[in-house]
C-alpha cells in the first residue's frame, strides 16, 4: 500500500513539475528591467527565451521574437537546449510511469517489469529536473554577471553610434517557476526510485521443491538422477516422483489429503 502511495505521489509531483517546466520555458518574464524612464514614456521591458516584450506606461504591450541580426547571448541557446531536453525527458518519463503505476493493470505485466519501468521513469524525472534547474541557474548567472549593462559606445561606419540602454536586470517570474518546477520533478523522480525498491520482488536463483510423503503411492522413476545433473531426457525438471515431489506452486494449487505438515 505504501509503495503504491509513494509511486502515485511521485507521479503526481513529477507531473506538476514537468507542467511547471513547460510553463517556465514558454514564459516571457525570464528577466525584467527596472522601470526605465525614457523621456517619451515610462518603459517596462522584459525578456523570455524566445522573445522580448515592452510595456508602456499607457498600458500598450508588444512582444517580438528575437532578431538574430541584433545578436543573442550564446548562453541563451544553451538554456533553451537544457529546458527542451528537460521537457522531452520528462514527457517520456511520464509516459513510462503511467504504464508502471501499480494501480493500473495492463495485461499480465509482472511486478519486476513495473519495477524496472518505475526506476526508468524515476531516473528520467531526476535528469529532467536537473536540466531545468541547470537551465534556470545558467540564465540567472547570466543576469547576475550583466547586472548593470555596459554603456560603452560602439561607433558604426556611418558616423552614428549604438549603445545598450543602461538598465538594471532583475530575475523574472519564470526563473522562480523553473526552479520550483525543476525541484518538484527531481523530488518526484526520487520518490519513483524509492517506490521501485518496494515493487521489485525478491528473486531466488532456484525453484523451491518440497517433498511430501503421500502414503503408499510413492513410485521411483528412473531418470531422477539424470534430471538433477541436467543430462538425459528429463531436462525440464519434471516431477520425478508421482505424488511425492511437487513445486511450491503445485502444492498450493492441488493440496492432497495425504499431505503432512
Amino acid at each position: 500500500m505504501a509503495v503504491t502511495a509513494c509511486q502515485g505521489l511521485g507521479f503526481v509531483v513529477s507531473l506538476i513539475g514537468i507542467a511547471g517546466i513547460i510553463a517556465a520555458t514558454c514564459m516571457d518574464q525570464w528577466s525584467t528591467q527596472d522601470l526605465y524612464n525614457n523621456p517619451v514614456t515610462a518603459v517596462f521591458n522584459y525578456q523570455g527565451l524566445w522573445r522580448s516584450c515592452v510595456r508602456e506606461s499607457s498600458g500598450f504591450t508588444e512582444c517580438r521574437g528575437y532578431f538574430t541580426l541584433l545578436g543573442l547571448p550564446a548562453m541563451l541557446q544553451a538554456v533553451r537546449a537544457l529546458m527542451i531536453v528537460g521537457i522531452v525527458l520528462g514527457a517520456i518519463g511520464l509516459l513510462v510511469s503511467i504504464f508502471a503505476l501499480k494501480c493500473i493493470r495492463i495485461g499480465s505485466m509482472e511486478d519486476s517489469a513495473k519495477a524496472n519501468m518505475t526506476l526508468t521513469s524515476g531516473i528520467m524525472f531526476i535528469v529532467s529536473g536537473l536540466c531545468a534547474i541547470a537551465g534556470v541557474s545558467v540564465f540567472a548567472n547570466m543576469l547576475v554577471t550583466n547586472f548593470w549593462m555596459s554603456t560603452a559606445n560602439m561607433y558604426t561606419g556611418m558616423g552614428g553610434m549604438v549603445q545598450t540602454v543602461q538598465t538594471r536586470y532583475t530575475f523574472g517570474a519564470a526563473l522562480f517557476v523553473g526552479w520550483v518546477a525543476g525541484g518538484l520533478t527531481l523530488i518526484g523522480g526520487v520518490m519513483m526510485c524509492i517506490a521501485c525498491r518496494g515493487l521489485a520482488p525478491e528473486e531466488t536463483n532456484y525453484k523451491a521443491v518440497s517433498y511430501h510423503a503421500s502414503g503408499h503411492s510413492v513410485a521411483y522413476k528412473p531418470g531422477g538422477f539424470k534430471a538433477s545433473t541436467g543430462f538425459g531426457s528429463n531436462t525440464k525438471n519434471k516431477k520425478i516422483y508421482d505424488g511425492g515431489a511437487r513445486t511450491e506452486d503445485e502444492v498450493q494449487s492441488y493440496p492432497s489429503k495425504h499431505d503432512y505438515v
Partner: nanobody, 120 residues
Framework: QLQLVESGGGLVQPGGSLRLSCAAS????????MAWYRQAPGKQREFVSG???????NYADSVKGRFTISRDFAKNTVDLQMNSLKPEDTAVYYC??????????????WGQGTQVTVSS
C-alpha cells in the same frame, strides 16, 4: 547594423520653419521608440520630442505647440516639423531609435546629427 541618417537641417530666420527627417536603414527592424534630441554648443544633449509604437507622444516644454513629430512605420522614418523657430533652437539635432522588442539587450541607436541654425 541599424543606421540612422538625418536630413533637412540648415539656416533659417527666426519665426521660420524646417522639417527634419530621419531614416533608419541597414536592418529591417522597426524600433519601439523614436525620438529627436538636440545639443547646443557647450550644453548637454536634451530631449526634444519622441513617439512610441504604442502611440505615446511627448514634447519638451520648450518646444510644445511649435514642433510636431510624426512617424511612418512602413518606411521606418520619423519627421520633426519645426515651426516658429527661435534663436535658442540653434543646435545639432540627433535622431534616436530605441529597440526593446526582438533583442535580448535593449539598444539605443543614434544618428550623426544635422545642424539647425536660427539666425537673422
Amino acid at each position: 547594423q541599424l543606421q540612422l541618417v538625418e536630413s533637412g537641417g540648415g539656416l533659417v530666420q527666426p519665426g521660420g520653419s524646417l522639417r527634419l527627417s530621419c531614416a533608419a536603414s541597414g536592418v529591417d527592424i522597426s524600433s519601439d521608440v523614436m525620438a529627436w534630441y538636440r545639443q547646443a554648443p557647450g550644453k548637454q544633449r536634451e530631449f526634444v520630442s519622441g513617439l512610441t509604437r504604442g502611440g505615446s507622444i511627448n514634447y519638451a516644454d520648450s518646444v510644445k505647440g511649435r514642433f510636431t513629430i510624426s512617424r511612418d512605420f512602413a518606411k521606418n522614418t520619423v519627421d520633426l516639423q519645426m515651426n516658429s523657430l527661435k534663436p535658442e533652437d540653434t543646435a545639432v539635432y540627433y535622431c534616436n531609435a530605441e529597440i526593446y522588442t526582438g533583442t535580448f539587450y535593449p539598444r539605443s541607436y543614434w544618428g550623426q546629427g544635422t545642424q539647425v541654425t536660427v539666425s537673422s
